[in-house]
């Protein structure tokens, strides 16, 4: 707490300027009112406080505002933002997405904070669903942040949406989570034509049932390896050796050194002999 | 990308004068703090300048006040560091590096030595 | 000026230690700190700030932790690529100072 002292004659803050980064502590809470601090918020981050008086500035707006600050103060935080705990955060009501934007650049560069967090969860939970402008926000600056919701969550996600993911932002969801995306990703690009919605939907196919994967192995899309290694063991099993043969194209040959690896290894003692040795790669069910 | 690229480092006197520039790319100077900070041979980090362009705000170490000063040509993405009465103890690696608070870029450094 | 001091100047380990690195400040500077790593003739690289966040890129053995004016750097499983000096800095008031760094050697 900073004690409260009288402002020195002279020295009463008119305006938000670069004069106040040579305010003491003391000097900086008697001297700048806080109605005139949360009127010219714009301007303070384009003024160098030292980290000291930012501790300042916010135990003001803290006391102007003790239900929350409203939102044309927090769209001005900027490195403001990095001295609020997520229990502050909570009391706040976000709605613009340029706010949201603005206190992300803050952060941009770390992985997420619980302040961060705690941001993102009042946002989403204002708007109800998670909107296409909000993922392509949110998954530009966090590409993991997909994979960083639940199951239920992700289920609100409109499947209009899923045309903001971008394939990395998938590398970090499990099977669980993929489940819940693929659905909404094959409603989303039903209406590409085959190679096409094959480059499109490949980063979901973790969450592929085996009629679908089926389907795909008339479709000459040859999947690499790479996918083929995350699909479900149990999409994977019902599938034959032709379907697979298909399904991978010139990639099929990858088969043999991933042949101790799941999906592989299981599809393999599910085959039969004969039928694997028509690929010609020495796979032993 | 973000790079930054310093220039400007020598041999020079005891009393001498250089102009170090620290070039700026893949972001603009004007949204960012630009700080020098300086090594001697075998010694740890010590910050010497600060700028704020928005403002033109700067603030010095203590060790170089009066005889160094920091400013940037917005136009040309560049910060500089104009030293003057240069002294055996400024020698030392320069490195120009960006940010607020802590330095998330740095320069590769120019070497000035100061001796006669 | 706020002082901070590091702890130790220097130390010997293996790969695979675990390695704890301290700085402390002369005078309170909340989470107003930063670490940063530097390897022989290049130039220092931004581990962690604000006390514990990391930054991006960065392995996640790096942790930083501390409040007030005590600070600890740990890196949790020591790999041959982490020797080098490591400094802590003070961004809390003007002047930003450094620590005097800590040399981690191979044992």
């Known amino acids: 707490e900073v004690e409260k002292t009288a402002c020195p004659s002279g020295k009463k803050a008119r305006e938000i300027d670069e004069s106040l980064i040579f305010y003491k502590k003391w000097e900086l809470e008697a001297c700048v009112d806080a109605a005139l601090l949360a009127t010219q918020m714009d301007r303070v981050n384009a003024i160098p406080f030292t980290y000291e008086q930012l501790d300042v500035l916010k135990h003001k707006l803290d006391e102007l505002y003790p239900q929350g600050y409203p939102e044309s103060v927090i769209q001005h935080l900027g490195y403001l933002f990095l001295k609020m705990s997520p229990e502050d955060i909570r009391k706040w009501n976000v709605t613009s997405l340029e706010t949201l934007k603005a206190l992300l650049e803050v952060n941009k560069g770390h992985e997420m904070s619980p302040q961060v967090a705690t941001l993102i969860d009042r946002f989403v939970k204002g708007r109800g669903q998670l909107d296409k402008d909000t993922l392509d926000t949110l998954t530009a600056f966090y590409p993991g942040y997909l994979c960083s919701l639940s199951p239920e969550e992700l289920s609100s996600v409109p499947p209009s949406s899923i045309w903001a993911v971008r394939p990395q932002d998938l590398d970090t969801c499990d099977p669980r989570q993929l489940d819940v995306l693929y659905p909404k990703a094959r409603l989303a690009f039903q209406n590409m034509n085959g190679s096409e919605y094959f480059v499109k939907i490949q980063s979901f196919l973790g969450g592929a049932p085996t009629e679908d994967l089926k389907a795909l192995s008339q479709q000459n899309v040859s999947m690499d390896l790479a996918t083929f290694m995350k699909l479900r063991t149990d999409a994977v099993l019902p599938l034959t050796v032709a379907e697979v043969q298909k399904l991978l194209g010139p990639h099929v040959e990858g088969l043999k050194a991933e042949e101790r690896h799941r999906p592989v290894r299981d599809w393999i003692l599910r085959q039969r002999q004969d039928d694997l040795d028509t690929l010609g790669l020495g796979l032993q069910g | 990308e973000v790079q930054l690229v310093e220039s400007g480092g020598g041999l020079v006197q005891p009393g001498g004068s250089l102009r170090l520039s620290c070039a700026a790319s893949g972001f603009t100077i004007t949204d960012r703090t630009i700080h020098w900070v300086r090594q001697a041979p075998g010694k740890g980090l010590e910050w010497v300048a600060s700028?704020?362009?928005?403002?033109?705000?700067?603030t010095y170490a203590d060790s170089v006040k009066g005889r160094f000063t920091i400013s940037a040509d917005t136009s040309k993405n560049t910060a500089y560091l104009q030293m003057n009465s240069l002294r055996a103890e400024d020698t030392a690696v320069y490195y120009c590096a960006r940010g607020r608070y802590w330095m998330d870029y740095w320069g590769q450094g120019t070497l000035v030595t100061v001796s006669s | 000026d706020i002082q901070m001091t590091q702890s130790p100047s220097s130390l010997s380990a293996s790969v695979g230690d675990r390695v704890t690195i301290t700085c402390r400040a002369s005078q309170d500077v909340k989470e107003g700190v930063a670490w940063y790593q530097q390897k022989p003739g290049k130039a220092p690289k931004l581990l962690i700030d604000q006390s514990h966040r990391l930054y991006s890129g960065v392995p996640s053995r790096f942790s930083g932790s501390g409040s007030g004016t005590d600070f600890t750097l740990t890196i949790s499983s020591l790999q041959p690529e982490d020797f080098a000096t490591y400094y802590c800095?003070?961004?809390?008031?003007?002047?930003?100072?450094f620590g005097q760094g800590t040399k981690v050697e191979i044992k």
């Open positions: 800095q003070q961004y809390y008031a003007w002047p930003s100072t």
């Open positions: 700028i704020f362009p928005t403002k033109g705000v700067t």
